[in-house]
Structures are given as C-alpha cells and as structure tokens.
C-alpha cells in the first residue's frame, strides 16, 4: 500500500525556518519575503512505529529528493543526519527505525522524538544559522518545539 504522506515546512518556536546547508545538513535561520522560498519542504510520511495516543510515528523526507532525516550513533552520541536512500524503495510504511520520529503535539507545538533514541529530539540552537541537530534535553537553551505549515 502506498504510504500516506503530506508536504509541509517546519519552523522552530523562534520562527526560524529550515534550509539546506550543504548537501547533507540543515540549518535554522530567520527568513522573510522571497527568501522563504529557500526553506526545505518536507514529505512527512505516516509509518509504523511505537504509536501511542500522544505520539504519531512519521518519517521526514525532503520533497523531491531521496534524502531522509535519520538518527545514528556517531562517536557514541545520537546524531541527526540526512541520509540518501533508493527512491524506488522509499518512502515505505515499514521504515527502518533510524528514520522514524514520534511526532508529539503539545499546546499546538510539535516535537519530534527519535524512535531509535528515546528522549532525543530534533533541535535547533538559539543562535542564527546553526545546524539542526539531535538534542537530549527539552525545555533548556536549545529549541525542540516546532510549528508545521502545510504545503499543497
């Protein structure tokens, strides 16, 4: 069965947009006007995972690219990366665990928890133009809350 997907953009709680920074990295910065066209459009796919009444498992691909956000250990630390996949096989309903994020909605804000590394979240820095990363703390300096904008 074709996996159900939607197209969207994400902004962090400081209203920073996400853009490509080199071929395999995202960064977060404030964009206005025509510059908003630089922001990445995600293809969010609804996949199998440890779903609960509060958490919906999703995979986050980049629209029209064979790149997915994935979570792996690098130097013994959970790390967010953009991983290249075979477009013939992705997206699929049974994504490998490293590609799966638990989408959590709290007070109209979204968090994305790694399924592979519980309590690690897609995060941005307070500072401008810093890489999007996997962070192990909520409610601290780093930002783990996002809003989603649907794209047709």
């Amino acid at each position: 069965a074709p996996v159900r997907s939607l197209h969207c953009t994400l902004r962090d709680a400081q209203l920073k947009s996400l853009v490509m920074s080199g071929p395999y990295e995202l960064k977060a910065l404030h964009l206005q006007g025509q510059d908003l066209e630089q922001q990445v459009v995600f293809s969010m796919s609804f996949v199998q995972g440890e779903e609960s009444n509060d958490k919906i498992p999703v995979a986050l691909g980049l629209k029209a690219k064979n790149l997915y956000l994935s979570c792996v250990l690098k130097d013994d630390k959970p790390t967010l990366q953009l991983e290249s996949v075979d477009p013939k096989n992705y997206p699929k309903k049974k994504m490998e665990k490293r590609f799966v994020f638990n989408k959590i909605e709290i007070n109209n804000k979204l968090e994305f928890e790694s399924a592979q590394f519980p309590n690690w979240y897609i995060s941005t820095s307070q500072a401008e133009s810093m890489p999007v990363f996997l962070g192990g703390t909520r409610g601290g300096q780093d930002i783990t809350d996002f809003t989603m904008q649907f794209v047709s």
Epitope: A1, Q48, G49, E50, S52, K55, M95, P118
Partner: antibody, heavy 122, light 107 residues
Framework: EVQLQESGPGLVKPSETLSLTCTVS????????VSWIRQPPGKGLEWLGL???????YYNSPLKSRLTISKDTSKSQVSLKLSSVTAADTAVYYC????????????????WGQGTLVTVSS | DIQMTQSPSSLSASVGDRVTITCQAS??????LNWYQQKPGKAPKLLIS???TLPPGVPSRFSGSGSGTDFTFTISSLQPEDFATYYC?????????FGQGTKLEIK
Amino acid sequence: EVQLQESGPGLVKPSETLSLTCTVSGFSLRDYGVSWIRQPPGKGLEWLGLIWGSGDTYYNSPLKSRLTISKDTSKSQVSLKLSSVTAADTAVYYCAKQTNIWGYDLYGMDYWGQGTLVTVSS
Amino acid sequence: DIQMTQSPSSLSASVGDRVTITCQASQDIDMDLNWYQQKPGKAPKLLISQANTLPPGVPSRFSGSGSGTDFTFTISSLQPEDFATYYCLQSDWLPLTFGQGTKLEIK
C-alpha cells in the same frame, strides 16, 4: 520460555473499577510491548490497547476514557484498570506479548496468557 | 479503523477435508495479517504471521496466502485436533482489529 499469566478478582460490581495484572516471564517488559484483549462469553475478540517497552500507551477509542494500562518492569507486571464497569464488560481478559519486530511485524501478537474471566454483577 | 470481514462464520467438515477461510480488510494492509486458533476455554494460539509465515512448531498442513485486502487460510487435511474457532487479525495499523471468527465443527 515465554509465559504470560493474568490474575485479578473474578467478580466486580457495576460502576466499580476492574483491576487485572499480567505477570510475564521469558522476556523483558523493557524490550516488548504487551496488549490486552477481551472476549465476552460466546463472542469474538476485542483489542483493548497496549503498553510499549517505552511505557507509552495506546488505547482503543471506545474505551479510551475508562482504560488505564501501566507496568512495573522490575516486577515483570503489566496492569489493566477499567473504570465504571457495566455488565457489558463481562468477559475473559487476555494479555499478549507484542512481536515488536521493526520493519517486519511490529504490531502482531505472538504469545498469549490463558485468560481470566471477569464477571460484572451486583 | 480497519474493518476485518471473515467468512464463513461457521463451517462443518470431516477429518481429512481441505478447509478454506477468508478474511477481507477494509483497506490495503500489505501482508500484515495473522491467523489464530482458539479452542474452548483456551487462549488463542498464533498459527500464521505476516499472511503466510508459520511460527516454529505449527504443522505444515496450515497455510496462509494473500496480500492487500484479500487473505486466505487453509488447512490441507483436517485433523481431529483442528476443530476450533479461527480468527484473523490485522497488524498493519493501530487499533488492531480481529475478524469475527470462524467456528470449525465436525460434520
């Protein structure tokens, strides 16, 4: 060897809370989810909900407001609480281990307890 | 929620017969379908996972096939111990849903 065993009172009064325990062995509740299923006398199977290894829960919509599933990993026990029971909640209640195989059969159930009959009556 | 329609609801057969039970899903569930056998007063036992896979220890007279929305469970040659009720379960999406069951009786 994987085993699950349900226990709890066989009789509950209407409007009270039904409480059951599922004690497991042969696997860790840190690694595997456990589902609860019930079967009214002479009827089919109804899936109630589950608790994952992480402790996150999913409750089937019709029972969501009355159902609580929790666990004590150190005791290898999963508990089910169903509040405000009526005669319609009379059933054999089963717990079952989730297959939990990512990318293959994440949601299936492979081992079941023998079940415990709960009658709701005054 | 995904609805599972199982048929027939009951079936009479003799030892040695070939028996087929079907299950239809209300939407495409790939191969995420399990079959269980339940004897009176006992818990369901897994016979087939992922539409066609036999767990260790399940006799080879049991088989399953299908994908998408239409699934079949077959007992190639009925044995006396096979008289029981059989259920399909979709394990594709939560909430999990069962078929209504098929009671297999001795003719």
